[in-house]
Amino acid sequence: EKSDLRTVAPASSLNVRFDSRTMNLSWDCQENTTFSKCFLTDKKNRVVEPRLSNNECSCTFREICLHEGVTFEVHVNTSQRGFQQKLLYPNSGREGTAAQNFSCFIYNADLMNCTWARGPTAPRDVQYFLYIRNSKRRREIRCPYYIQDSGTHVGCHLDNLSGLTSRNYFLVNGTSREIGIQFFDSLLDTKKIERFNPPSNVTVRCNTTHCLVRWKQPRTYQKLSYLDFQYQLDVHRKNTQPGTENLLINVSGDLENRYNFPSSEPRAKHSVKIRAADVRILNWSSWSEAIEFGSDDG
């Protein structure tokens, strides 16, 4: 188990226990209970109070990070007396040994890389392990392929994201023969960590007066539909003076992605490239390959 649990309790204890795998806090049921509540307080004095489970002798915390250390508290009243018990959940191990600079990104719609750095005070034999649990906590994913630096795990590559949901809990545990290693945990939204591919199937068709650009929305890990996308088109006249402004056009996603613009013959050589983003986050993809149209003698 990743941390010491210390109980602060009066003589007759509720025997409060916490399972970090399921994020479930439980205690001994008391006869004739009239009131019970559980909550945690973090290092910034923020309080999180989840709903009690049906049996009223446990509660499950949904979206919490524990690496800064928290204190759980249970209050129970019975028809005879009141009980209160605190459970300290520190992040035991030497300060500064936990993995740091942790980040993940999803790319190519179904791949994910997570990276981290070794803690500044971590010993040379430190080894880190990544575990991921989805918001439904139905299954735990262990890192299948570690990225290593001098034998130490400093990243993870996943090529199967089927176990993820929209919000996921990431835990990096550490081990060493020398000292205790602190853990690091984080909650990440897949929406916020996905890097889109550029739009595909970009085509340009011109008639005597106009050019029509068409493209397909990128394949994404998240289930997105056409209104969730924003596009930017860079229509660029070739062989212009350096410093000439490119024409950047913003286009909202549509069922049929297209942009029609006036361009009469004879037309000079142009290029067009497109990038995509989530309309709410505007985390732009890289640009698509430039498509050329028009002629050198236009």
Partner: antibody, heavy 120, light 111 residues
Framework: QVQLVQSGAEVKKPEASVKVSCKIP????????IHWVRQTPTKGFEWMGG????????VYAQRFQGRVTMTEDTSIDTAYLTLSSLRSDDTAVYYC?????????????WGKGTMVTVSS | QAVLTQPSSVSGVPGQRVTISCTGS?????????VSWYQQLPGTAPKLLIY???KRPSGVPDRFSASKSGTSASLAITGLQADDEADYYC???????????FGGGTKVTVL
């Protein structure tokens, strides 16, 4: 211009079933998600169900659970709504709609609607 | 009874600005879930006007704008025109009902 083509009006007796179709010409149903919504003068719009990406399956509104089935035939790009054990208060215009956004569900394009009348 | 509450009607003269309110609760608009707005002309299917609280699909004129605050949202139509005469509906998601919810609709009359 993309259009959703719905089947024609139906008149049904109480306790019967009705099946409404919704075709998307020129578009692959496998790349789109369809939801069904009905409209009555008294209750207004009522969401009936549709594809939920988080569950990766079709989900139904609680009040229609057990009476409604939504199916798709991707080979002909057609979605179907079947409502059974019809009652007079199921008389409504039934719309299929393409999901334009999933967060939360937004209906980007609606079919013209299918009038279903339940009368003895 | 609609989950989201809208005024049953509003009216204005051509060129005027009218607003329509949509009030929800902590399980829908205040959760917070985004709001969409639809226009339904007499005898036709609804048409999407606004999504993600304030974004317009291509082809919707910028006379239509919307905003959201807390558990309420509003749609504004500036430079009111005769062909804006229609029913307008707000829509969001409700976590307690696990599905889409709609307002009862507002009839806009151009005097």
């Amino acid at each position: 211009q993309v259009q959703l083509v719905q089947s024609g009006a139906e008149v049904k007796k109480p306790e019967a079933s009705v099946k409404v179709s919704c075709k998307i010409p020129g578009h692959s149903l496998s790349e789109l998600s369809i939801h069904w919504v009905r409209q009555t003068p008294t209750k207004g719009f009522e969401w009936m169900g549709g594809f939920d990406p988080e569950e990766n399956e079709i989900v139904y509104a609680q009040r229609f659970q057990g009476r409604v089935t939504m199916t798709e035939d991707t080979s002909i790009d057609t979605a179907y709504l079947t409502l059974s054990s019809l009652r007079s208060d199921d008389t409504a215009v039934y719309y299929c709609a393409i999901v334009g956004s999933f967060s939360p569900i937004t209906y980007g394009l609606w079919g013209k609607g299918t009038m279903v009348t339940v009368s003895s | 009874q609609a989950v989201l509450t809208q005024p049953s009607s509003v009216s204005g003269v051509p060129g005027q600005r009218v607003t329509i309110s949509c009030t929800g609760s902590g399980s829908n608009i205040g959760a917070p879930y985004d709001v969409s707005w639809y226009q339904q002309l007499p005898g036709t299917a609804p048409k999407l006007l606004i999504y993600h609280n304030n974004k317009r699909p291509s082809g919707v004129p910028d006379r239509f704008s919307a905003s959201k605050s807390g558990t309420s949202a509003s749609l504004a139509i500036t430079g009111l025109q005769a062909d804006d005469e229609a029913d307008y509906y707000c829509q969001s998601y409700d976590s307690s009902l696990s599905g889409s919810v709609f307002g009862g609709g507002t009839k806009v009359t151009v005097l």
